[in-house]
Structure formats: C-alpha cells, structure tokens
C-alpha cells in the first residue's frame, strides 16, 4: 500500500514523492534499499533527498531500484517505498507501454489532458505538447496551466500525447517528458452544474475525541461519463495534500457510480484519532466540473457523553 512505482528516462529529471506523507516540519530520511545506504541531502549530488522528495538530476539507468523513505515525527515513524525504474531513451517514435501514464478519455464536448507528475517539478509555462511525436499546432490545441485542451474533439484525436517541460533547480535546467494515451468516447450523456448530495450545507457532524471519523463528499454531475468532474475536501481552504496533517487523509480514487443514470462521485475524508483542534477547522466539500463549483461546509462538534440517570 505504501509502495509507489515511478519511472523516467535517462538524462531527464525525475522527482519522486515519498508515498507516506507528513507535516512539512517532519524529517524525511531516504535510503537506497539494496544497500541501506543513506541518500545525501546536499544539492551538489546528482541524486539527493529534499524532504518528501527524492530528486534525480538527471537520472541514470543505474539509479533503478527500490528507495526507502522514513517520515519521522516526535511520536512516530512511517516507512514508504519508491520503486524507481530509469529507462534508456528510445531511438524511434514509439513510446513503450511501461513508460505510459494512465489513459484519459475525452469527448466532443470536453477534453482535457493533464501532464502527469508535473506538480512535483519547478516548471514555468508554457508546456510543449506532442502527439505521436509531432508537435501540436493549430488553434484547436490550447496549452493551459498543466493541461492541454482540445477543441471539437474528433476520433482522429485519439493517440499518445507527450508533454515536455523544463525543471529548474538552482539555475540548472533539466528536461522532463511524460506520455499518456488519450481515447475519444461518444458522448451520449450530458453535463450539469454539480449537485452535492452529501454533506448537507452547514452540517454539524458529531464526533468523539480520540475516535476515528469519516466525512463523505458526494456529488452528481449529469448523465453518462463525466470527464472533467471532481469532488474533493478542503481544510480551511487548503487541499488535504497541502494541509500536512497525516491523521487527516482523503480516500484515494473516486468512485463513479450511476444511480438513476446519474454520474456521481464520492470522496471520503478520514480523520484518525480526532483531536480538539479538529473541531476548529472548516471542512469544505467541493464539487466542480466545466460548469462551475459547488461547496458545502461541515463543522465538527464534540459528541456529548450520554447522561446516565438513576
């Protein structure tokens, strides 16, 4: 569960995040598992550790292997494993399956291809995009932030899309490429403004201090497959991943269910060992798609112990 596959190409930058997360203030130690040798933190090294990140600048085939990260806090240690594989660059245009990130789908109405892993890097716009090794040109293609938007998608737009960007580290530039497949689906359904089914707006959720609590954010977005829909939790206006409290996690993956033909998504927020300070936070369930954003706020309150009357 706490092991993650990462891959890259030789002579490109590769940055890997520790699969175990903690507060920014926690120490993270990295080791090369085969030799149990500590990864240095000095940036002059080609491979060095920087908190939760392990950086290969640039990567070499010999760097392949399993790396261990240990998140250390005053009260616990958490261990994760990064399985890193560095491949030689291909001479031809074909991108082998093992270098592919997850496939994304699009339709005539909405198509968005995110550049995989880009949020780990220090990059500046614009991104360069290629399809089957050809640079994309024409007004139908729009590079926006970390994704590509294709207007008026056609079946011929299916294929392998590669994003290319430059990672900057202390004034030195390193190239990074990432490829994923894009498939085009016939859009039979329709998309609406998100409708949040749970939680209710301004809901007060009773919790017990020291126990675990779950909050579910559930929203529907229309009929049929929805490509640009998401539900997520925020704590005091901050994404869970950026909040840095390991006790509070979003359940990975979003379940797309079809009740009454509606496309709905769920995201569960798990709070372990509820603490007093958790009651002071604002929990926002956000549901968003192409049409807009909907938000329901939840606050936690302490469950009063049941009075026992004689």
């Amino acid at each position: 569960k706490f092991s993650k596959q990462s891959w890259g190409l030789e002579n490109e930058a590769l940055i890997v995040r520790c699969p175990r997360q903690g507060k920014p203030s926690y120490t993270v130690d990295w080791y090369y598992s085969q030799t149990n040798k500590s990864i240095p933190t000095q940036e002059r090294n080609r491979v060095f550790a920087s908190g939760q990140l392990l950086k290969f600048l640039p990567a070499a085939v010999a760097d392949s292997g399993i790396y261990t990260c240990i998140v250390r806090s005053p009260t616990f240690n958490r261990t994760g494993y990064a399985n890193v594989t560095i491949y030689k660059k291909q001479s031809d245009c074909n991108v082998p399956d093992y270098l592919m990130y997850s496939t994304v789908s699009g339709s005539e109405k909405n198509s968005k291809i995110y550049c995989p892993t880009i949020d780990l890097y220090n990059w500046t716009a614009p991104l360069e995009w290629f399809k089957n090794c050809q640079a994309l040109q024409g007004s139908r293609y729009r590079a926006h932030k970390s994704f590509l938007v294709i207007d008026n998608v056609m079946t011929e737009d299916a294929g392998d899309y590669t994003c290319k960007f430059i990672h900057n580290e202390n004034g030195a530039n390193y190239s990074v490429t990432a490829t994923r497949s894009f498939t085009v689906k016939d859009e039979q359904g329709f998309s609406l403004f998100p409708v949040i089914g749970a939680p209710a707006q301004n809901e007060i959720k009773e919790v017990e201090i020291g126990k675990n609590a779950n909050l579910t954010c559930s929203a529907c977005f229309g009929k049929g497959t929805q490509f640009l829909a998401a539900v997520l939790w925020q704590l005091n206006g901050t994404k869970i991943t950026d909040f840095g409290e390991p006790r509070i996690q979003q359940e990975e993956g979003q379940n797309q269910s079809f009740s009454n033909g509606l496309a709905c998504l769920d995201m569960v927020l798990r709070i372990a060992d509820v603490k007093e300070e958790d009651l002071l936070l604002q929990y926002d369930c956000l549901a968003l798609n192409l049409h807009g954003l909907r938000r329901h706020t939840v606050r936690l309150s302490r469950k009063n112990p049941i009075d026992h009357h004689s």
């Epitope: 926006h144 932030k145 403004f193 707006q201 640009l228 998401a230 997520l232 925020q234 005091n236 206006g237 901050t238 994404k239 604002q282 926002d284 956000l286 968003l288 798609n289 192409l290 049409h291 807009g292 954003l293 909907r294 938000r295």
Partner: antibody
Framework: QVQLVQSGAEVKKPGSSVKVSCKAS????????ISWVRQAPGQGLEWMGG????????NYAQSFQGRVTITADESTSTAYMELSSLRSEDTAVYYC??????????WGQGTTVTVSS | EIVMTQSPATLSVSPGERATLSCRAS??????LAWYQQKPGQAPRLLIY???TRATGIPARFSGSGSGTEFTLTISSLQSEDFAVYYC????????FGQGTKLEIK
C-alpha cells in the same frame, strides 16, 4: 473582512483589449468561484463568465465566447478578465463577484471601461 | 439559455406599504434563484438565494418565494432605503439575469 477590490477605470480604443483585475481577501480564495458581470450605462446586469481558481477551469456566456478570457492566480488570490476586440458597445461597468454556490454574495466595487476612438 | 422576465418594469409604492416583484423563468430552474438590490453608482447586493433564503444581514422584511418557473420577492413594509432596482438571477444553468424592476416612491 471579505472583499473584492478591482483595478481602476480604463479608456480604450476600438479593436484593442482590456484586462481588469480583482483581488480577493478575507476568505479562502480556492473554495469559491469568481464570476464577471457587466452593466452598460442605464442597462441591466449581464453575466460574462466565471473561473474556478482551484482548477483553473473557466466557463463563458455564449455571447462572449472567443472574446473573453477569465483566469485566476491562486498565489495572489486575484482573478482577471480580459476582453479583446473592443467596440463602443463594450463601454460598461465591469464587476467581479464571488460565486457562492451559484449566487453572487460578494461584489467588487466595479471598473468602468470606456471604449472610444 | 434560460431567459428571465421580470414584471413590472417599474413599480410605484408608498413607504410603509408592501411591494411584490415577480420573476419568471423560460424553463424550470428548481429553487436556483437569487434576488439582488442595486442602488445608483453601487454594486448589486445579494438579498435572497435558493429562492427563499435571506442572505447574511438582510432585514426580515425581505422575503422570497416560488420554485420552478414563477418567483416572487416581497418587501413587507417599504423603508426609504429600499427604493432601488431589483434583479432576479437563475443559477440552475449558466447564470442569467432578469432585466430588472425599478421600485420607486409613489
């Protein structure tokens, strides 16, 4: 307190572009959308489009499609509206507004854009 | 797009009396309807959302009702500061506003 502060008045020539900014403060910027609404002299309110800062996704009214670009910068809690190919009919007060589940609960003070040759 | 039609265009009422403003949608917008008040030289102010819920700080004399395609804003006892232009707005789909009702002193 919660507020939206817009950039100052602009005078533009026909055919040019204008970019208006809207700085948010006093609330969690990424938890809400920002919409832009304009009002021509003596006329009603017209929704131009909106942006979701957390995703960067923008949505535009059909009548402005291709001519307006709405963006948001999370790092500065600022939204922007750029309108191109200006014509005299674009002379109006342009408002940004916080989108609270579809209703606009907080408004900027408005930016007057005058298009004149 | 959903067309919002407000009536009347102008409404003349005496202070202390009740004012009733109407808004009709070209198709059902459920309860996704808001009302705004705008005074000259000022930005609009949200009065009602969800067809009937008063926004923060809005006096109890303002009330909203309706669902589907027919909506009403009622001001129970008009104060001098209530004379302004009122707009309805639907947000079931891409937002659209009504053309406004001007509430003037009789």
């Amino acid at each position: 307190q919660v507020q939206l502060v817009q950039s100052g008045a602009e005078v533009k020539k026909p055919g040019s572009s204008v970019k208006v900014s809207c700085k948010a403060s006093g609330y969690f910027f990424t938890s809400y959308g920002i919409s832009w609404v304009r009002q021509a002299p003596g006329q009603g309110l017209e929704w131009m489009g909106g942006v979701i800062p957390i995703s960067g996704t923008a949505n535009y009214a059909q009548s402005f499609q291709g001519r307006v670009t709405i963006t948001a910068d999370e790092s500065t809690s600022t939204a922007y509206m750029e309108l191109s190919s200006l014509r005299s009919e674009d002379t109006a007060v342009y408002y940004c507004a916080r989108d609270e589940n579809g209703a606009f609960d907080i408004w900027g003070q408005g930016t007057t854009v005058t298009v004149s040759s | 797009e959903i067309v919002m039609t407000q009536s009347p265009a102008t409404l003349s009422v005496s202070p202390g009396e009740r004012a009733t403003l109407s808004c009709r949608a070209s198709q059902s917008v459920s309860s996704y309807l808001a009302w705004y008040q705008q005074k000259p030289g000022q930005a609009p102010r949200l009065l009602i959302y969800g067809a009937s819920t008063r926004a923060t700080g809005i006096p109890a004399r303002f009330s909203g009702s309706g669902s589907g395609t027919e909506f009403t804003l009622t001001i129970s006892s008009l104060q001098s500061e209530d004379f302004a232009v009122y707009y309805c707005q639907q947000y079931d789909n891409r937002p659209t506003f009504g053309q406004g009702t001007k509430l003037e002193i009789k």
